[in-house]
Amino acid sequence: VPRWRQQWSGPGTTKRFPETVLARCVKYTEIHPEMRHVDCQSVWDAFKGAFISKHPCNITEEDYQPLMKLGTQTVPCNKILLWSRIKDLAHQFTQVQRDMFTLEDTLLGYLADDLTWCGEFNTSKINYQSCPDWRKDCSNNPVSVFWKTVSRRFAEAACDVVHVMLNGSRSKIFDKNSTFGSVEVHNLQPEKVQTLEAWVIHGGREDSRDLCQDPTIKELESIISKRNIQFSCKNIYRPDKFLQCVKNPEDSSCTSEI
């Protein structure tokens, strides 16, 4: 008789999840010599231990602490790039500007990027059929709690000028319900962070509006200012040219506004 299994609203665990995490861990240590002390088998065990045999709606930050410890990493605190709803461009940017880091440029972010995972209460099985959806099922699911935990730690580590890339094509350029809006903004440390600089990325070629005047950006400025952190904002009118100029800053066309 097949065992009854909870049906969740979200997609199930990414196929070959354990192998993917292990392979990514090894790949990361290959690229980043400073992380070669990392024991990828222990990393997988700690990752697995955070959600296996636990109810996937009852995961806590505490469950991830062994993994957090194994993945402890020092990134230059003044070279942090946060992003919201514009991951691909943020990653393209840090691939060119190698001294800046998104969360997914750290070991733990790299391991979990674009993956889904969950287990089942009281069994050692990984659920490949379905996992809880943040809205439709529960917020304390393995994936959401993981990103909340690593995002909080990443924001807490930031100092000096912190940059955030925001998607100017969205109806809410700054969304209080995003990970940036609900976690990272509130965990920047005013005693360490002097300024949050927002880069609003324009979508349309002919879009010459000053999106720094958008009401949601003003809301972000208000939240940040109340936390005793300065705020500044820049429009990135042409993201393609922006990336090109990061690659080749000497290019004569890069002196004009991008």
Partner: antibody, heavy 121, light 107 residues
């Protein structure tokens, strides 16, 4: 099959520099993810990790001995060389080289047979 | 540096006995502990890594467990070829450090 073999002097005088060579087969340090480390063991005592080197020339040393140690590799000869300056009788030990592999952090899975180095005047 | 303390330093046992060796780390090393077997005049042989993973070719009578600071190597049924010295090693951080060894002798 991976094999490693240590070679070098069996006797060195105090204050001299020790040069040890690890020659290996079935392993290439031009292959991503591979490394070779050195460990020593004084007679009747425990093991002590000294240093290791990765395929991309990334090196790590035991901080307590760092000022005296240099590790290098010659990929074409399949060799790793450890030099240790200012030898002292307390450095008398069997010196081993061993393989390390990325992802298992610093787990040494294949070891050489070891070479006994005596420091005495 | 992380100190690795093994106990006992030596033990006497008979063939067929269940033998347990413990290792305590001076700080949390999660599960980054390896165990080695060494016979006189020979190089150490890897038995267990990452606390509980048996290395290729190691007999199933050898098992490892533990996490955090306390780790155990168990030989479920001691064989004549198992009389040797056993070392634990933390592979969590540099400098890599070893325990002082546990000598398993014939009773």
């Amino acid at each position: 099959q991976v094999t490693l073999k240590e070679s070098g002097p069996t006797l060195v005088k105090p204050t001299q520099t020790l040069t040890l060579t690890c020659t290996f087969s079935g392993l290439s340090l031009s292959t991503s993810g591979k490394g070779v480390g050195w460990i020593r063991q004084p007679p009747g005592k425990a093991l002590e990790w000294l240093a290791h080197i990765w395929w991309d020339d990334d090196k790590r040393y035991n901080p307590a001995l760092k000022s005296r140690l240099t590790i290098t590799k010659d990929t074409s000869k399949n060799q790793v060389v450890l030099t240790m300056t200012n030898m002292d009788p307390v450095d008398t030990a069997t010196y081993y080289c061993a393989r390390i592999e990325l992802g298992r952090s610093y787990v040494m899975d294949y070891w050489g047979q070891g070479t006994l180095v005596t420091v005495s005047s | 540096d992380i100190q690795m303390t093994q106990s006992p330093s030596s033990l006497s046992a008979s063939v067929g006995d269940r033998v347990t060796i413990t290792c305590r780390a001076s700080q949390d090393v999660i599960t980054s502990v390896a165990w080695f077997q060494q016979k006189p005049g020979k190089a150490p042989k890897l038995l267990i890594y990452s606390a509980s993973y048996r290395y290729t070719g190691v007999p199933s009578r050898f098992s490892g467990s533990g996490s955090g600071t306390d780790f155990t190597l168990t030989i479920s049924s001691l064989q004549p070829e198992d009389f040797a010295t056993y070392y634990c090693q933390q592979h969590y951080t540099i400098p890599l450090t070893f325990g002082q060894g546990t000598k398993v002798e014939i009773k």
